[in-house]
């Protein structure tokens, strides 16, 4: 039976040509995290395997870097990154585990406009 | 006790294919990743490539990628190497290496096959 | 793909003596880098996993230490059969690599 449950930072935006760390927790279970993959849609963007460590996808490799931990940096920013991020956590013997963040990115004076409004 | 044996290497011509097999004993082979290093005469370690235990991912050296194949067969504890299209530079001695499971050390090696490209 | 550079690339030391060699990644690898003992003809022995992790069977002389970009293998007093060329691994990131290597040598 699948027990755990993955906690996710959720919806995150970020100004353009900054960047963002994209983090998942898998908690409430014992089983083995063999491997973690981060995909944007149906694209693959890097995978973190328990044996043979971090492998980035070719057409990334300039802008995402591995970490911290099991998490995801993306690095310069642009308007077409907005979209929805998804964790999948491969366990034994549970089986697979999927988060979801969902990303907005925003032109420099829009997230400056929008801090001024946050409630602290 | 654990123990591994490689096999295929040999004096072939550049351009032309070689298959390396690498025979694991003594130990739960579907349980591990394994790994080709290998070690050109007088020079130091380079990793090749390596799998993890059900085939899922697989990595490679840039100097072989495109022209080399890992693979594995669980139920033969075997581990292979297909090389193609080799080069002068691939002359080597190849060995199969076994890590430390999830530690990514390499605890356990063959004592290595011999590939000499040459015409 | 990450880079290890040891140095030095030689040393020559005497029985007894301490002998420290670094290995330093062009990118930071956390604690994924291991050392390797090799001697003619022979193949590598594994001496320290996760920069600082001994080996089972290996002497307690041997000892590995740093984290992220810089790290160091030490041998705290070298014995006859310590004479050998030794190799820093990264596994981090896919490709996984060695450094270059470092031969002790007898003074």
């Known amino acids: 039976m699948m027990t755990g449950t993955i906690e996710t930072t959720g919806n995150i935006s970020a100004e353009k040509g900054g960047s963002i760390i994209l983090q998942c927790h898998l908690s409430s279970t014992t089983a083995q995290v063999t491997q973690v993959n981060w995909e944007q849609q149906d694209q693959l963007l890097a995978i973190c395997n328990a044996d043979l460590g971090w492998h980035i996808s070719p057409s990334f490799k300039d802008r995402v870097a591995p970490g911290p931990g099991l998490g995801l940096t993306l690095q310069s920013l642009t308007v077409n990154d907005t979209g929805e991020y998804f964790c999948i956590y491969h366990t034994y013997p549970d089986g697979t585990y999927t988060g979801r963040i969902f990303l907005e990115v925003l032109e420099s004076s829009v997230a400056e406009h929008g801090a001024r409004f946050q409630i602290p | 006790q654990v123990q591994l044996v490689e096999s295929g290497g040999g004096l072939v011509q550049p351009g032309r294919s070689l298959r390396l097999s690498c025979a694991a004993s003594?130990?739960?082979?579907?349980?591990?990743?394994m790994h080709w290093v290998r070690q050109a005469p007088g020079k130091g370690l380079e990793w090749v490539s390596g799998i993890t235990w059900n085939s899922g991912l697989i990595g490679y050296a840039d100097s072989v990628k495109g022209r080399f194949t890992i693979s594995r067969d669980n139920a033969k504890n075997s581990l292979y190497l297909q090389m193609n299209s080799l080069r002068a530079e691939d002359t080597a001695l190849y060995y199969c290496?076994?890590?430390?499971?999830?530690?990514?050390?390499?605890?356990?090696w063959g004592q290595g096959t011999m590939v000499t490209v040459s015409s | 793909d990450i880079q290890l550079t040891q140095s030095p690339s030689s040393v020559s030391a005497s029985v007894g003596d301490r002998v420290t060699i670094t290995c330093r990644a062009s990118q930071g690898i956390s604690s994924w880098l291991a050392w390797y003992q090799q001697k003619p003809g022979k193949a590598p022995k594994l001496l320290i996993y996760?920069?600082?992790s001994l080996q089972s069977g290996v002497p307690s002389r041997f000892s590995g230490s740093g984290s992220g970009t810089d790290f160091t293998l030490t041998i705290s007093s070298l014995q006859p059969e310590d004479f050998a060329t030794y190799y820093c691994?990264?596994?981090?990131?896919?490709?996984?690599?060695f450094g270059g290597g470092t031969k002790v040598e007898i003074k």
């Open positions: 691994q990264q596994a981090f990131y896919l490709p996984w690599t």
């Open positions: 290496a076994k890590p430390v499971p999830r530690l990514r050390g390499l605890d356990v």
């Open positions: 003594g130990f739960t082979f579907r349980d591990y990743a």
């Open positions: 996760g920069a600082s």
